[in-house]
């Protein structure tokens, strides 16, 4: 099935860019993790099988290519131990500010609430932030700055993050110049800041996994969104022209084509690996979008209680995530002391 193959290519691109070698191995060697992933992704069995075959090949390539991938895991852990106290402080401050904002928050634009602004607020990254981060072109028209996506970026953004159509539509809406300018500048600054934290591993958002359960469900949900975005793109007549294609597709047919008798299995290759679970940092980006919109001086008058509720919900979810991070920080500290 050609459509299925394109989806598999998109999925492999996602895994290459966003999932670390050790988390990929975890997925492929832990049946519970794989089942949870398939359930979260809602993959029909044939696609699950096809994806698994492709991931087997990808894992082999990643291991062969990246001989020191295990050391990198340690580097991530060290980075996390060093940076977490500062990030924790910032996040706690953000949660406080968010709760304060919730009391007097107002409508953003013609009835659009935070639900439209943040795409699945705690998925891989914020929808609007991704619109900016993925290179969506800001330009002025009639005195107002508008976010419009070139065809290819729309495809890639939708495919990689599963941004809902309502969010993309919202990105197209007119913003006042001040609001949009603020959004773009601050978002790019934030991306730059996080880029400095992660160095060359900015794309490896999932290299720090909350725990096995969260990791597999998180990846699964992203793959489900990617699959749905792919299906939606197929149903748009002109979408084929902007279909994001993987430059180096990896499928069951490419990579290691012949299974040699003496070739070690993925299970064997990953034996002895310490898969310490650490939470994803990507949601640190989420709040900035909320603030870029809600701290703006240009908000309309008239607070909306349902919007405030949504803000409180985001704060609560972030607090839960922070608790997970905190637990993992303690585990890693204890591990280091052993």
């Amino acid at each position: 099935d050609p459509e299925s193959s394109i989806f598999i290519e998109d999925a492999i691109k996602y895994f290459k860019e966003k999932v670390s070698t050790q988390n990929l191995l975890l997925l492929l060697t832990d049946n519970e993790a794989w089942n949870g992933f398939v359930a979260a992704a809602e993959l029909p069995r044939n696609e699950a099988d096809e994806l698994r075959k492709a991931l087997d090949n990808l894992a082999r390539q990643m291991i062969m290519k990246d001989k020191n991938w295990h050391d990198k895991g340690q580097q991530y852990r060290n980075w996390f131990l060093k940076e977490f106290p500062r990030l924790k402080s910032k996040l706690e401050d953000n949660i406080r500010r968010l709760r304060a904002l919730a009391d007097g928050v107002q409508k953003v634009h013609k009835g659009t609430t935070i639900a439209n602004v943040v795409s699945g607020s705690l998925s891989i990254s914020s929808g609007i932030l991704t619109l900016v981060g993925m290179g969506l072109a800001p330009f002025t028209e009639g005195g107002s700055l508008v976010l419009l996506e070139p065809g290819m970026e729309l495809g890639i953004t939708a495919a990689l993050t599963g941004i809902t159509s309502s969010t993309i539509d919202y990105g197209k809406k007119w913003w006042t110049q001040a609001q949009a300018h603020d959004l773009v500048i601050k978002s790019l600054d934030k991306l730059k800041e996080v880029k400095e934290f992660l160095g060359e591993n900015i794309s490896n958002f999932l290299s720090l996994a909350g725990n096995t359960y969260q990791l597999t469900r998180g990846i699964g949900k992203d793959i489900r969104a990617l699959r749905r975005a792919r299906a939606n793109l197929q149903s748009v007549p002109h979408a084929s022209a902007s279909r994001p294609r993987v430059t180096e597709p990896i499928s069951a047919e490419s990579g290691e084509q012949v299974e040699r008798v003496n070739e070690p299995s993925i299970l064997e290759m990953s034996r002895g690996v310490k898969l310490t679970d650490v939470a994803p940092v990507s949601f640190f980006l989420v709040l900035d979008v909320v603030y870029l919109v809600y701290e703006s001086k240009h908000l309309h008058e008239g607070a909306k209680s349902e919007t405030a509720e949504e803000l409180k919900k985001v704060a609560q979810e972030l607090e839960e995530k922070l608790n997970i991070l905190n637990n993992n920080y303690k585990i890693l500290q204890a591990d280091q002391e052993l």
């Epitope: 519970e32 794989w34 089942n35 398939v38 359930a39 809602e42 096809e50 698994r52 299995s265």
Partner: antibody, heavy 115, light 106 residues
Framework: QVQLQQSGPELVKPGASVKMSCKAS????????ISWVKQRTGQGLEWIGE????????YYTEKFRGKATLTADKSSNTAYMQLSSLTSEDSAVYFC????????WGQGTTLTVSS | ENVLTQSPAIMSASLGEKVTMSCRAS?????MYWYQQKSDASPKLWIY???NLAPGVPARFSGSGSGNSYSLTISSMEGEDAATYYC?????????FGGGTKLEIK
């Protein structure tokens, strides 16, 4: 331990419908796909379809589309399969199975369609 | 529809004997799955992803193959191995099973 407990045998008349159940225990119900398989007496196995209890998403084999309807009740950790417009060809043992590799199976529900 | 043909349909082996049964697919498959079923019992997952033994399956069992041709091997037949073994593919819908190989003790 993981268990899939299926409902008891059914004897129904041609043209009628039947709904059988598969109660899961020993694991998180929504974390695994549930599949259904048909086996006629003395014959091989036939895949019917699969469902994701978390969302209710279902996939059916073409042959069973319109014949089988898969549902789930998350509150009771139970998956259901309804078979409609029954004929003698539907007489068989029906199994539910868990997960992407069908690692656990129910004991089967025997369906007899006879006038 | 991808037709899976198992051979032989029925075979008998002496205790301690090496046993090999095959499963041929009319179209190439990514992985083969094997289930063991004893009379009046549910099938049990036996081998998954072509060569992985399900929990509790004795190490004398092994699975191998690729493309259109797969096999299940028992290095040394034991009495409890007498059963019917089904192969199955999930590569293309409908997900088909083979007709089964019934293994008996000689």
């Amino acid at each position: 331990q993981v268990q899939l407990q299926q409902s008891g045998p059914e004897l129904v008349k041609p043209g009628a419908s039947v709904k059988m159940s598969c109660k899961a225990s020993g694991y998180t119900f929504t974390d695994y796909v549930i599949s259904w398989v048909k086996q006629r007496t003395g014959q091989g196995l036939e895949w019917i379809g699969e469902m994701f209890p978390g969302s209710g998403t279902t996939y059916y084999t073409e042959k069973f589309r319109g014949k089988a309807t898969l549902t789930a009740d998350k509150s009771s950790n139970t998956a259901y399969m309804q078979l409609s417009s029954l004929t003698s060809e539907d007489s068989a043992v029906y199994f539910c199975a868990r997960g992407t590799t069908a690692d656990y199976w129910g004991q089967g529900t025997t369906l007899t369609v006879s006038s | 529809e991808n037709v899976l043909t198992q051979s032989p349909a029925i075979m008998s082996a002496s205790l301690g004997e090496k046993v090999t049964m095959s499963c041929r697919a009319s179209s190439s498959v990514n992985y083969m799955y094997w289930y063991q079923q004893k009379s009046d019992a549910s099938p049990k997952l036996w081998i998954y992803y072509t060569s992985n033994l399900a929990p509790g399956v004795p190490a004398r069992f092994s699975g191998s193959g690729s493309g259109n041709s797969y096999s299940l091997t028992i290095s040394s037949m034991e009495g409890e191995d007498a059963a019917t073994y089904y192969c199955q593919q999930f590569t293309s819908s409908p997900y088909t099973f083979g007709g089964g190989t019934k293994l008996e003790i000689k």
